[in-house]
Interface confidence: medium
């Protein structure tokens, strides 16, 4: 069952999503997708990377956090009720069949009356993350150089709080763990 | 193109406390992490520190992180370097970095500079 | 904290291939400190050339390469110019905060 987290219309929403790179440095592919994981990639996308940078993204949708710690969380900014529903965060591990698949569910309340928009800390409990900026996408994205072949050993998502501001400074304490290879 | 200019330097006396500024064009500053980075007279660089896009996380070089805040307005696509307490050894060019690409921006944050703005601590 | 060396000059001639160091007090370098160059031309004015240990900017000649060499973070200039003259900076990642090194000023005749 997917995992729930919860954001206020108006409000910036957040679903964590982390993985862990055999040798640093090292980006997996990952997309993000509106509704439920399918078999292959992700369905109704609305960001993805590549080995370098992300690649594609659409308004309102954007990763915030560092990579050094495997962070692909995905914002989604000014969320409003039609936000609700299942998210797909899906680690393109490259082999066949071997992508790893996370179903996240986001729901939505209506805004409390407040005089003027506040910072919040709004998501679940497990989450008190602080997330109030502006923007648009980037203006641009560029390419690095090549990277090394990739080969993952450890995916995770998160469930449970991590213990750093950096959001995952030991995924092994996270949620769910799954080690490959 | 991207362009980014430091101001705020000037001279300072000890103890005193300065607000350096690095306005921010040519790209959506607000998706970037951001860095300062200082060399003092005749010397090499040292690392400040750097703050994520939504300022979540801000991360300081251990010596400095008691003297200097780094803080952002992304409405405005400005970083900010608030020093207190500045000493002789403060007397440094100071800038700004941006890295190259957003999302790896973590691992190669030092790919695009300001000029630099001279801070001066004198009495 | 950590400490991290450069050499302090090196002497190179066109067309020549010439590898400057970086060295960490703490052991060896890594893909985890994510070794990065940062080229500094007269008037102060700094360009990166290689982050995540071996990851070009865009614009930046091939003739520079980045790697591991031993223990070591190595930037490589392959047929190197005159206008590479300049100091070259390294800058390692340690865990929630990055070290420059003190540079090395490479000079091309």
């Known amino acids: 069952s997917e995992v729930e987290y919860r954001a206020e219309v108006g409000q910036n929403a957040y679903l964590p999503c982390f993985y862990t790179p055999a040798a640093p440095g090292n980006l997996v592919p990952v997309c993000w997708g509106k509704g439920a994981c399918p078999v292959f990639e992700c369905g109704n996308v609305v960001l993805r990377t590549d080995e370098r940078d992300v690649n594609y993204w659409t308004s309102r949708y954007w990763l915030n956090g560092d990579f050094r710690k495997g962070d692909v969380s995905l914002t989604i900014e000014n969320v409003t009720l039609a936000d609700s529903g299942i998210y797909c965060c899906r680690i393109q591990i490259p082999g066949i069949m071997n992508d790893e698949k996370f179903n996240l569910k986001l729901v939505i309340k209506p805004a409390k009356v407040t005089p003027a928009p506040t910072r919040q800390r709004d998501f679940t409990a497990a989450f008190p993350r602080m997330l109030t900026t502006r923007g648009h996408g980037p203006a641009e994205t560029q390419t690095l150089g090549s990277l090394p072949d990739i080969n993952l050993t450890q995916i995770s998502t998160l469930a449970n709080e991590l213990r750093d501001s950096r959001l995952a400074n030991d995924l092994r304490d996270s949620g769910a763990t799954i080690r490959i290879g | 193109e991207v362009k980014l200019l430091e101001s705020g330097g000037g001279l300072v006396q000890p103890g005193g406390s300065l607000k350096l500024s690095c306005a921010a064009s040519?790209?959506?500053?607000?998706?970037?992490?951001m860095s300062w980075v200082r060399q003092a007279p005749g010397k090499g660089l040292e690392w400040i520190g750097e703050?994520?896009?939504?300022?979540?996380?801000?991360n300081y070089t251990p010596s400095l992180k008691d003297k200097f805040l780094i803080s952002r307005d992304n409405a405005k696509n400005t970083l900010y370097l608030q020093m207190s307490k500045v000493r002789s050894e403060d007397t440094a060019l100071y800038y700004c970095?941006?890295?190259?690409?957003?999302?790896?921006?973590?691992?190669?944050?030092?790919?695009?500079w300001g000029q630099g703005t001279l801070v001066t601590v004198s009495a | 904290q950590a400490v991290v060396t450069q050499e302090s000059a090196l002497t190179t001639s066109p067309g020549e291939t010439v590898t400057l160091t970086c060295r960490s007090s703490t052991g060896a370098v890594t893909t985890s400190n994510y070794a990065n160059w940062v080229q500094e031309k007269p008037d102060h004015l700094f360009t990166g050339l290689i982050g995540g240990t071996n990851n070009r900017a865009p614009g930046v000649p091939a003739r520079f390469s980045g790697s591991l060499i031993g223990d070591k973070a190595a930037l490589t200039i392959t047929g190197a110019q005159t206008e590479d003259e300049a100091i070259y900076f390294c800058a390692l990642w340690y865990s929630n905060h990055w070290v420059f090194g003190g540079g090395t000023k490479l000079t091309v005749l």
């Open positions: 703050i994520n896009p939504d300022s979540s996380t801000i």
């Open positions: 040519g790209f959506d500053f607000s998706r970037y992490w």
């Open positions: 970095a941006r890295p190259n690409g957003y999302y790896v921006g973590t691992i190669f944050p030092f790919a695009y």
